[in-house]
Amino acid sequence: SQVSQNCHNGSYEISVLMMGNSAFAEPLKNLEDAVNEGLEIVRGRLQNAGLNVTVNATFMYSDGLIHNSGDCRSSTCEGLDLLRKISNAQRMGCVLIGPSCTYSTFQMYLDTELSYPMISAGSFGLSCDYKETLTRLMSPARKLMYFLVNFWKTNDLPFKTYSWSTSYVYKNGTETEDCFWYLNALEASVSYFSHELGFKVVLRQDKEFQDILMDHNRKSNVIIMCGGPEFLYKLKGDRAVAEDIVIILVDLFNDQYFEDNVTAPDYMKNVLVLTLSPGNSLLNSSFSRNLSPTKRDFALAYLNGILLFGHMLKIFLENGENITTPKFAHAFRNLTFEGYDGPVTLDDWGDVDSTMVLLYTSVDTKKYKVLLTYDTHVNKTYPVDMSPTFTWKNSKLPNDITGRGPQ
């Protein structure tokens, strides 16, 4: 049913869903701080633009009585319950920030006639792609998939002279929310990744993964997994690995690789790490100091959600346009706005674009080094290190199938 929005006469409210089930186990206080920081900046920007309006946030808390798993498994109904709470209280703002779980976002989008924008820090799954009034401020699975296909096909770089068409995917069901949906997208038989690969097998058991490392009859040399170095070590330990194995470790929201004093452990030498460029993100700052890397990005996405709303509000007010219209709800895409750390670009479907970075471990320095970058906005790879000091033979990435000649 239609809910009246607190979104007119110079007073604009943001509804922030504070769900017990969240993509990351972030203390709600940190999210509140991020939202309040964003609000202050928005107020300043509007004031500087000569717009004398009020912008506030209403935090909508789940009672946590029924949906108390703390992760995304029981989030489907929690999101709808919170919407019902908003509806009963007649307290809908101009925009809804949250939820972060793919299940809840999908269900809320499906079960409501949304004439207002939804901004999500999360909602990584393919089922949340191409939603007209949904904006996602953390890299969704589709972006990862497009990178992987692009990289697999690349064969004209000094360090990658073979196109790849095969892969193993390790997915054991204990992944974090982001990893769960990233790997889910790679596993899905109808996904772009599956469509473009000739061979793909999902490894679900630790032993399957461990056996592949030295199996002479393996069908691919490439294994994709998701998590941090510690996760890989638990699985791989110090086991011997065939020299032409390449492990792609997806660890998008972890900044630790860029810290000055970090040395790559020996077990990372066969690994390429895919992460996000730290960009302007300042590691030496209190905003990130007390949060683990992934969580830092989560709070940052909430903050950027507030700044995005402020950006759109400013544009519409300056143009004398109404905020409670489908036009406003559909406007949160195909744009660049001033985020907390600098410009943030959203694609045609409201998904954040970013620079992904592929790192390798230098056998000389034992440091993580940038091999290449990938701009998700233009789907293009840019080589950085033309003569990497790889562990692989001739400082080139091996073919994906042992014994197969140049492609």
């Epitope: 701080d33 991020a34 309040n36 920081e37 964003g38 609000l39 202050e40 900046i41 107020r43 300043g44 920007r45 004031q47 500087n48 302007n280 993100s281 300042l282 030496n284 700052s285 209190s286 905003f287 001033e338 907390y340 750390d341 600098g342």
Partner: nanobody, 124 residues
Framework: QVQFVESGGGLVQAGGSLRLSCTAS????????MGWFRQAPGKEREFVAA????????DFADSVKGRFTISRDRAKNTVYLQMNSLKPEDTAVYYC?????????????????WGQGTQVTVSS
């Protein structure tokens, strides 16, 4: 052109207090983190305190923690550094600076606009 003017410096006895102000003109103030740095004669310019664009996050050098506080007033385009329990080693020229983004930062090269500085002298 963005300009910052510091004020509030002076001579004070050890254990005393001062409040430094940094007022901005010619630029959008609240989009940016702000910081205070200081430079004693013959020494490198060092970080003292910082505040984020929205004022929610603050950071301090270990040497001033618990003695100094930083705040900002959006309406007045001003950042304040309240300095209590001053020590002779706090003697320096204090500079305010604007960060390139709204984020809090203690790294000097993340700041692009600087004030002229105000002298603080703490006598024993």
């Amino acid at each position: 052109q963005v300009q910052f003017v510091e004020s509030g410096g002076g001579l004070v006895q050890a254990g005393g207090s001062l409040r430094l102000s940094c007022t901005a003109s010619g630029g959008i103030f609240s989009n940016y983190g702000m910081g205070w740095f200081r430079q004693a004669p013959g020494k490198e310019r060092e970080f003292v305190a910082a505040i984020s664009g929205g004022g929610v996050y603050t950071d301090f050098a270990d040497s001033v923690k618990g003695r100094f506080t930083i705040s900002r007033d959006r309406a007045k385009n001003t950042v304040y550094l309240q300095m209590n329990s001053l020590k002779p080693e706090d003697t320096a020229v204090y500079y305010c600076a604007r960060a390139r983004t709204a984020r809090l930062t203690s790294r000097r090269h993340d700041y692009d606009y600087w004030g002229q500085g105000t002298q603080v002298t703490v006598s024993s």
